[in-house]
């Protein structure tokens, strides 16, 4: 069983899923309002968003005193965060600016990918090896969308029987999408294109918030029960509480290299020939050069206009 990394508003914590009755280890303390969290295991980095400080920050696993600011301007409510461990990029959602953005892992070369038809974007999940990203939107027209990580091929994949889609996670081995709905109180799964939808846990969960997966087990935080729960990812059986008495459980991830499988990085050689951003793409050559917001890509498709 994995270590579970979760945001707890005031801090980030790690808890052993097999021994959740033990106290969780505080990874980073003294925080204001930590909401989203993710990591790049191979780089030893943990990222989180703070919705009160309107910032995205990071630390190194073994140097928790060294907190670095990554993105500190132009954020209002960065509710969702995801690390592209292959392309070494950071993606985030902001439910007040109504944007989905991407940058380098250090926050540089920031680009707005989506800014239209977003209402309350929340959870975001990446599949770098296929070049797709997924996000939930719990706004007036709730939905789950998929798009290329380069901003292409945007498509609504779930828009029925959905109300407050909060948690979202991907099963890379089985090519499935899992999500939790806090109003309809369920966990459902589907194929990555939204087809073959099935209930995993039928509507009985008080207020599921964030969702993660490790091997055959789903783990999620619940705002109402102040706990982390788990069940079998196929059947929903074996529902159990593995860690309780959490101050304010927010985002959660299975903290393991297994959740960030290695694959060929199409941007790996010479940044794909891109002068600035090289983003994963679902279509050949499986990457796309891109420029920071406000800077034009030249006709060669590789170089950003001078002054970027």
């Amino acid at each position: 069983a994995p270590l579970l990394l979760y945001a707890n508003r005031r801090d980030l914590r790690l808890v052993d899923a097999t021994n959740g009755k033990e106290n969780a280890t505080i990874v980073v303390g003294g925080l204001e309002d930590a909401a989203a969290v993710d990591f790049v295991f191979s780089h030893g980095l943990i990222y989180w968003s703070d919705v009160s400080e309107e910032a995205i920050k990071r630390t190194e696993f073994n140097k928790t005193e060294s907190v670095q600011n990554v993105v500190v301007s132009g954020l209002l409510s960065p509710d969702g965060l995801a690390c592209d461990w292959l392309g070494e990029k950071l993606y985030w959602t902001d439910s007040e600016t109504n944007r989905i953005e991407v940058s380098n892992l250090d926050g540089s070369l920031r680009k707005v990918l989506f800014w239209q038809e977003l209402d309350q974007p929340r959870a975001i999940a990446l599949d770098p090896s296929s070049g797709f990203m997924y996000w939930t939107d719990w706004g007036e027209v709730p939905k789950i969308e998929r798009a290329g990580m380069d901003g292409s091929s945007r498509f609504i994949i779930i828009n029925s029987e959905i109300y407050w889609p909060n948690g979202l996670t991907l099963d890379y081995e089985e090519q499935k999408l899992y999500w939790a709905d806090a109003k309809l109180n369920f966990i459902h799964k589907s194929n990555l294109d939204g087809t073959n939808r099935q209930a995993v846990v039928k509507g009985s969960l008080p207020h599921p918030f964030a969702l993660t997966l490790f091997e055959d087990i789903l783990y999620w935080t619940d705002w109402s029960t102040h706990s982390i729960l788990a069940c079998n990812k196929y059947t929903g059986e074996g529902l159990r509480e593995i860690h309780s008495d959490i101050f304010s459980p927010m985002d959660i991830h299975a903290f393991s290299q297994q959740r960030q499988p290695n694959a060929t990085n199409p941007c790996g050689i010479d940044n794909g020939g891109c002068s600035h951003l090289c983003l994963m793409s679902p279509v050949k050559p499986f990457y796309q050069c891109a420029c920071p917001t406000g800077v034009k890509l030249l006709e060669n498709g590789k170089t950003c206009k001078d002054g970027a």
Partner: antibody
Framework: QVQLVESGGGLVQPGGSLRLSCAAS????????MHWVRQAPGKGLEWVSV???????YYADSVKGRFTISRDNSKNTLYLQMNSLRAEDTAVYYC?????????????WGQGTLVTVSS | DIELTQPPSVSVAPGQTARISCSGD??????VHWYQQKPGQAPVLVIY???NRPSGIPERFSGSNSGNTATLTISGTQAEDEADYYC??????????FGGGTKLTVL
């Protein structure tokens, strides 16, 4: 062990009021949804009200505007304030925990307290 | 709200299998739970989440749920199983639906 004990039932005249209590022990009361269910003499079970772990309250249409559910987490106690009582409110009133680990089953139930509305 | 319909009564000989149905529109999309109530006592949970048995409930109790019908099955029924049985379905946050109840008589 997990236990619920109701009290406060009794005989009351139509139009009168009564407050039922349900003392909980053996579990983390504050995070659990708690329900009131009643059973009129010789009849089936009828759901009355719930207060969830976040404090949201809901009522059956038959009691809306007359009954108020509340909780005191510091005392591990659930309440049902019943006003403007009618003869048809005569029933045994049970409190029950919404067990989210059991997919939302009511478990356990209290032993019940009898409310009789009669002149 | 979905109405849950149960037969008012079911009779079974000792040692035989009793089946109590609970029907409702697309009930299979919700979790169904079953309670046993003996005279003068509070209800006791015997099946939760369609087919799970709480600890202390004999193995002869089982449940299933799909489509428009959930079923409580009591295999090798014993005299002590004579009671009223109620189905309900999880419907957060209200959870306001109980079946009308079935009186199980062991002949």
């Amino acid at each position: 062990q997990v236990q619920l004990v109701e009290s406060g039932g009794g005989l009351v005249q139509p139009g009168g009021s009564l407050r039922l209590s349900c003392a909980a022990s053996g579990f983390t009361f504050s995070v659990n949804g708690m329900h009131w269910v009643r059973q009129a003499p010789g009849k089936g079970l009828e759901w009355v009200s719930v207060i969830d772990g976040m404090g949201h309250t809901y009522y059956a249409d038959s009691v809306k505007g007359r009954f108020t559910i509340s909780r005191d987490n510091s005392k591990n106690t659930l309440y049902l304030q019943m006003n403007s009582l009618r003869a048809e409110d005569t029933a045994v009133y049970y409190c029950a925990r919404y067990d989210y680990i059991k997919y939302g089953a009511f478990d356990p139930w209290g032993q019940g307290t009898l409310v009789t509305v009669s002149s | 709200d979905i109405e849950l319909t149960q037969p008012p009564s079911v009779s079974v000989a000792p040692g035989q299998t009793a089946r109590i149905s609970c029907s409702g529109d697309n009930i299979g999309s919700k979790y169904v739970h079953w309670y046993q109530q003996k005279p003068g006592q509070a209800p006791v949970l015997v099946i939760y989440g369609d087919s799970n048995r709480p600890s202390g409930i004999p193995e002869r109790f089982s449940g299933s749920n799909s489509g428009n019908t959930a079923t409580l099955t009591i295999s090798g029924t014993q005299a002590e199983d004579e009671a009223d049985y109620y189905c309900t379905r999880t419907s957060t946050p209200i959870s306001g639906v109980f079946g009308g109840g079935t009186k199980l008589t062991v002949l």
